[in-house]
């Protein structure tokens, strides 16, 4: 007998062909021999089955000897063996209807788990294989679990259900609610304006929630809130801002913060958390601020950086157009009795300059 796989909510066509390409009598019945539909004269008649209001046939193909049955809005309980009686012969078709749904909302926070549940007819033993938009393959039986969703899991998941060498494909759209970046570092010279941006990795028609930037300055013994805000239909309103530093916040998305000037006492790392309406849990983005200061005091030229720097970063002081250079994998470098000229302080990572500050040393007579 032929096996046909169907998807819950979809439409399926069960085919039945007569040997002669002409209009003839036919009937479709279920396994309990209850008539579903058939032909009487030139008219389609329906029997007392539960399918009667969802079953149909292509009348236009009857004179070609094709007596298919179309079942709309498939239900799991439509799974059955259907019998087509035509020209004194019986054709059996086994229909297996499957459903695949996400156990919760398909808009999930990064780090939350996704569970896909397969609805299947009794007696079936299907296998499921899902492929994430990022190419991750996950296999399972009745349930498939993704324990910790990542940004790259956002998009259309393609799941294939297999039974009796037949397959049916499901597509499920998953939106992972996250910031575009988990972490970012801003490098600034002392006194420069600092811009922090927190773009989201998703778009929602209505975006409402609240948030906070919590900051741990390198020089401070404890962390504190720098700003709290509300978000109503993508409009940002500041709730409370600390007096020092006095941050400014953009009124529209993406979330955007401005620190009037970079100062050593502000260097450190922060965590922006965003709580979205009707979601338990929060989105997080780490942000780091590294501040550079170059100073000359008496016979000492010093360059310092504050904030979270990796030990492999190099800090150097170099005299422009001269070979004189002092380099260290440290947070401060200095030159005693520096030559007159324009000195450059450079913070670099494997030769790539992250931050530079120039300071002019005037000759002392």
């Amino acid at each position: 007998k032929k096996v046909v796989l169907g998807k819950k909510g979809d439409t399926v066509e069960l085919t039945c062909n007569a040997s002669q390409k002409k209009n003839t009598q036919f009937h479709w019945k279920n396994s309990n021999q209850i008539k579903i539909l058939g032909i009487q004269g030139l008219f389609l008649t329906k029997g007392p089955s539960k399918l009667s209001d969802r079953a149909d046939s292509r009348k236009s193909l009857w004179d070609q000897g094709c007596f298919s049955m179309i079942i709309k809005n498939l239900k799991i309980e439509d799974s059955d063996t259907y019998i087509c009686e035509v020209e004194n012969k019986k054709e059996e078709v086994e229909l297996l209807v499957f459903g695949l749904t996400a156990n919760s909302d398909t808009h999930l926070l990064e780090g939350q788990s996704l569970t896909l549940t397969l609805e299947s007819p009794p007696g079936s033993s299907p296998s499921v294989k899902c492929r994430s938009p990022g190419g991750k393959n996950i296999q399972g039986g009745r349930t498939i679990s993704v324990p910790q969703l990542e940004r790259q899991d956002s998009g259309t998941w393609t799941c294939t259900v297999s039974q009796d060498q037949k397959t049916v494909e499901f597509k499920i759209d998953i939106v992972v609610l996250a910031f575009q970046k988990a972490s970012s570092t801003v490098y600034k010279k002392e006194g420069e304006q600092v811009e922090f941006s927190f773009p989201l990795a998703f778009t929602l028609e209505k975006l409402t929630g609240s948030g906070e930037l919590w900051w741990q300055a390198e020089r401070a013994s404890s962390s504190k809130s720098w700003i709290t805000f509300d978000l109503k239909n993508k409009e940002v309103s500041v709730k409370r801002v600390t007096q020092d530093p006095k941050l400014q916040m953009g009124k529209k998305l993406p979330l955007h913060l401005t620190l009037p000037q970079a100062l050593p006492q502000y260097a450190g790392s922060g965590n922006l958390t965003l709580a979205l309406e009707a979601k338990t849990g929060k989105l997080h983005q780490e942000v780091n601020l590294v501040v550079m200061r170059a100073t000359q005091f008496q016979e000492n030229l010093t360059c310092e950086v504050w904030g979270p720097t990796s030990p492999k970063l190099t800090l150097s002081l170099k005299l422009e157009n001269k070979g004189a250079t002092v380099s260290k994998q440290a947070k401060a470098v200095w030159v005693l009795n520096p030559e007159a000229g324009m000195w450059q302080c450079l913070l670099s990572d494997s030769g790539q300059v992250l931050l530079e500050s120039n300071i002019k040393v005037v000759p002392t007579w």
Epitope: A220, K224, T228, R240, D244, T273, A275, K282
Partner: antibody, heavy 119, light 107 residues
Amino acid sequence: EVQLVESGGGLVQPGGSLRLSCAASGFTFSSYWMSWVRQAPGQGLEWVANINEDGNEKYHVDSVKGRLTISRDNAKNSLYLQMNSLRGVDTAVYFCAREGGQWLALDYWGQGALVTVSS
Amino acid sequence: DIQMTQSPSSVSASVGDRVSITCRASQGISSWLAWYQQKPGKAPKLLIYGASGLQSGVPSRFSGSGSGTDFTLTISSLQPEDFATYYCQQANSFPWTFGQGTKVEIK
């Protein structure tokens, strides 16, 4: 270690005045909003007032407006609650608390000062 | 003013039990909600901030959830030191308001 110590509580007649103080230590007092919260005997907590870092922004619950006033002196690391025209319903333990927690939570509390308004 | 309603007002439980306390705000407060524990004669202690954030030093058996108007504090396995009164508090708009409290008693 963060510490908040209230003082100035006691017995006062209806219509009388009292000034509660809260001495802060173990943190940069001038960097935090501060609150007063009270608790009547056997009752729940009631937020009374709060004040911003430099003292020029203040909020009070309607039931105490014009009678209880929050203030601070950053040079002395102190928070105050000036209580005038006191009534029986003001009888409570008054706690000072730091608004230093994430999401505006009150992360440190003093041990409380009992104010009894009775004739 | 935003009214905060806690339920139940008291709960009798045994050590090891799972206890849930709910708090409902009279209007949406996003995640501006904190939970406090208070023992007799002591000051309240912050447990949860921002509806679901666990305050540093608080045991992980305490958890918070919810957003908008409905919030829950859950103690996954009640310990002897957890018998106390618990309060929710909104920091969405002034005046800040507390729930009436939920007393967790020994059964």
